[in-house]
Amino acid sequence: EICGPGIDIRNDYQQLKRLENCTVIEGYLHILLISKAEDYRSYRFPKLTVITEYLLLFRVAGLESLGDLFPNLTVIRGWKLFYNYALVIFEMTNLKDIGLYNLRNITRGAIRIEKNADLCYLSTVDWSLILDAVSNNYIVGNKPPKECGDLCPGTMEEKPMCEKTTINNEYNYRCWTTNRCQKMCPSTCGKRACTENNECCHPECLGSCSAPDNDTACVACRHYYYAGVCVPACPPNTYRFEGWRCVDRDFCANILSAESSDSEGFVIHDGECMQECPSGFIRNGSQSMYCIPCEGPCPKVCEEEKKTKTIDSVTSAQMLQGCTIFKGNLLINIRRGNNIASELENFMGLIEVVTGYVKIRHSHALVSLSFLKNLRLILGEEQLEGNYSFYVLDNQNLQQLWDWDHRNLTIKAGKMYFAFNPKLCVSEIYRMEEVTGTKGRQSKGDINTRNNGERASCESDVLHFTSTTTSKNRIIITWHRYRPPDYRDLISFTVYYKEAPFKNVTEYDGQDACGSNSWNMVDVDLPPNKDVEPGILLHGLKPWTQYAVYVKAVTLTMVENDHIRGAKSEILYIRTNASVPSIPLDVLSASNSSSQLIVKWNPPSLPNGNLSYYIVRWQRQPQDGYLYRHNYCSKDKIPIRKYADGTIDIEEVTENPKTEVCGGEKGPCCACPKTEAEKQAEKEEAEYRKVFENFLHNSIFVPRPE
């Protein structure tokens, strides 16, 4: 029987009975928060062979081994993971061994075994036989191996029954418990599974099988299961489901969900039956089971129950993430915040249509409205009193509405209103009238020419660059000396620069009035000599990187209507020179014959230019005499070479800290202090542990159902 879609057993151990007839758990299995120590010996689920997602065990009192519960669990597929893990054993107070002696394969994901004070038999399991990569496994804070004294079957009687493998240069017996070896298949099977009698299974089997070379006798399938057979791909008119089986269209259409409407049921896309269309695709109509590509961002209609959505923080903006059509009105009131412009763009940047009005007031943290980077239509179906559909009032730092050279915005109905925006030039507002098609709708008092732009340099002259010079990490630029009507009112220049892979940046990108700015800023004083052109050397730049640069004059000059006159340049794009690349990564070499070496590597992390070729050098090394010291034809044990792995056993160091030899003199000496890198690594490790623990708690602690 297939059980699912995910089983959560908590609080009452008798809930385990739900697993009675399960052969496959399609989804996850949680066993957790059973605080009363129980006798689990009467609970045994020999039918369970596969979990398609992950297995999580957390705080189950009295459970000493998983072997009796799940004697035949063979495969954990890891189709969906718990924080990158397919097997999590966390804070299991009484667990003495894992004991899953039939576990042969964890298809995807790593394992996390942490804070299990009594747990042994961890160093005796060779996880590399079960997982593809063991580097992401996290096995920490369990019973120290020295206190375990793990013995594999037969070791005491000097008749060892288990096979040996090498882990971390230690060649040892591999077992799950004191009486269960870790199963290994003959090398002749290669990557194939094998039966209990060591006969190789069919290539489509995974984990084990009941008969050799038979695709109907598999315990689990390497790829997909269909009608009793393991198949490499789903047959025609069937679809992949949950990463392990093939189902027909009716099956897919009859998957129900308490969260979604029946018109939002599972879909068929790219040969798979899935919960919803993948990113970039949308249902082909409201009553469709199929997906079609979206033109541009996929439409997502969001509606505000109260008609008007107030955006006064990042949290309130978060509710609009992914929305492309907003049914209702937007009231933006951002007085303060950290990194607000980019946060708002992240959550509101996909909105294309607002059906009601947009009102921006008291938003002193905003410098620009460019965070609404896809807004193209304000319908004005609902308007503010006075028939306004775009209303901008008292925004002390607002300098730019949008970049009108790259923006089409239509206001279908209603007027615009602007007042008390001291840094917003009236010319910017007039430009918006032109673009949005509202010119002629506004009456005289709707755009106040006195209190909009009163503290801005609205009459801007253009500064022209005169020269640019680049090296691998420097740019030197000069520009024409700006001469305002009264030269004494020119205070200085400010140079703004940032990395710009594409030529599409604007002055207000990522900028807000609370100090966040994606541009680096450098102040440049006026050259004392009036004939020398101002300039700057920008250093500490990255090689072969395109930068955007612009310059602003800082002035005091007033012109008519008490408006400030200023000057700034266009944005200049300039690339630094190429440099020597960093070293190639992950160099591996292997011999595939007596006269050949295969060498592989990954590109450098910093190419610092366009890589055109690699240089490979090699030289012959003298043969290692070590290889001749042993008679490999004798039946003696082959020596295992011990390599220093560069790690310190912390426990040993703390036990006897005064036995090291320091320098050339013998004498008592303390352990070397930790390097900064080691300290940083420890800090990151502790942080990572906290993050995981928070994730675990947030995922599993839920309010009781009412």
Partner: antibody
Framework: EVQLVQSGGGLVKPGGSLRLSCAAS????????MHWVRQAPGKGLEWISV???????YYADSVKGRFTISRDNAKNSLYLQMNSLRAEDTAVYYC????????????WGQGTTVTVSS | EIVLTQSPGTLSVSPGERATLSCRAS??????LHWYQQKPGQAPRLLIK???QSLSGIPDRFSGSGSGTDFTLTISRLEPEDFAVYYC?????????FGQGTKVEIK
């Protein structure tokens, strides 16, 4: 021919248990969600439970915690285990295969009577 | 849960006349509403699926309309065999629910 044949109804005392069965034929049983609907004497239809193709189960509040829906795809059978029965559970019980947007062929069992009385 | 309210409770109509039955949902259910006819001692019979989609074998005098919260079943000319109880049923959200029924009787 697509059909659903029900069995297992009868008279039971309050607090007692009963198991209803519904045998399906003429279609791929495992590919359809299956429902139970009941009708008390002289009253309207009341939806009580569904089991989908994955085995996920959902219940009406009136039976939650007392009734259990299950299926055996190998036997093409649907079940309703009814425990802690009450007088108000007296009704004709129907098993029902509801279609969906893409394939809506509605099939009902013949109905089976459950009487809860002391 | 979504509550379906049918009106009127009883509808008295003469054969050959038009009958209009209403079903209102307590919240929007899109078009996931179905109409059933039930005669005494029989299982229900589906007439209209998804608000307005007709089914083969059902006479075309039965038609459905509506979406969101308001739905209507119309029987254009009542035949003697049409006198029965009619139920609406929503499958939009779990738990599914039925309306309390409208009895169509001979005037």
């Amino acid at each position: 021919e697509v059909q659903l044949v029900q069995s297992g109804g009868g008279l039971v005392k309050p607090g007692g248990s009963l198991r209803l069965s519904c045998a399906a034929s003429g279609f791929t049983f495992s590919s359809f969600a299956m429902h139970w609907v009941r009708q008390a004497p002289g009253k309207g239809l009341e939806w009580i439970s569904v089991i989908d193709t994955r085995g996920a189960t959902y219940y009406a509040d009136s039976v939650k915690g007392r009734f259990t829906i299950s299926r055996d795809n190998a036997k093409n059978s649907l079940y309703l285990q009814m425990n802690s029965l009450r007088a108000e559970d007296t009704a004709v019980y129907y098993c029902h295969r509801l279609g969906n947007f893409y394939y809506h062929m509605d099939v009902w069992g013949q109905g089976t009577t459950v009487t809860v009385s002391s | 849960e979504i509550v379906l309210t049918q009106s009127p409770g009883t509808l008295s109509v003469s054969p050959g006349e038009r009958a209009t039955l209403s079903c209102r949902a307590s919240q929007s259910i899109g078009s996931s509403l179905h109409w059933y006819q039930q005669k005494p001692g029989q299982a229900p019979r589906l007439l209209i699926k998804y608000a307005s989609q007709s089914l083969s074998g059902i006479p075309d005098r039965f038609s459905g309309s509506g979406s969101g919260t308001d739905f209507t079943l119309t029987i254009s000319r009542l035949e003697p065999e049409d006198f029965a109880v009619y139920y609406c049923h929503q499958s939009s959200r779990l738990p599914h629910t039925f309306g309390q029924g409208t009895k169509v009787e001979i005037k």
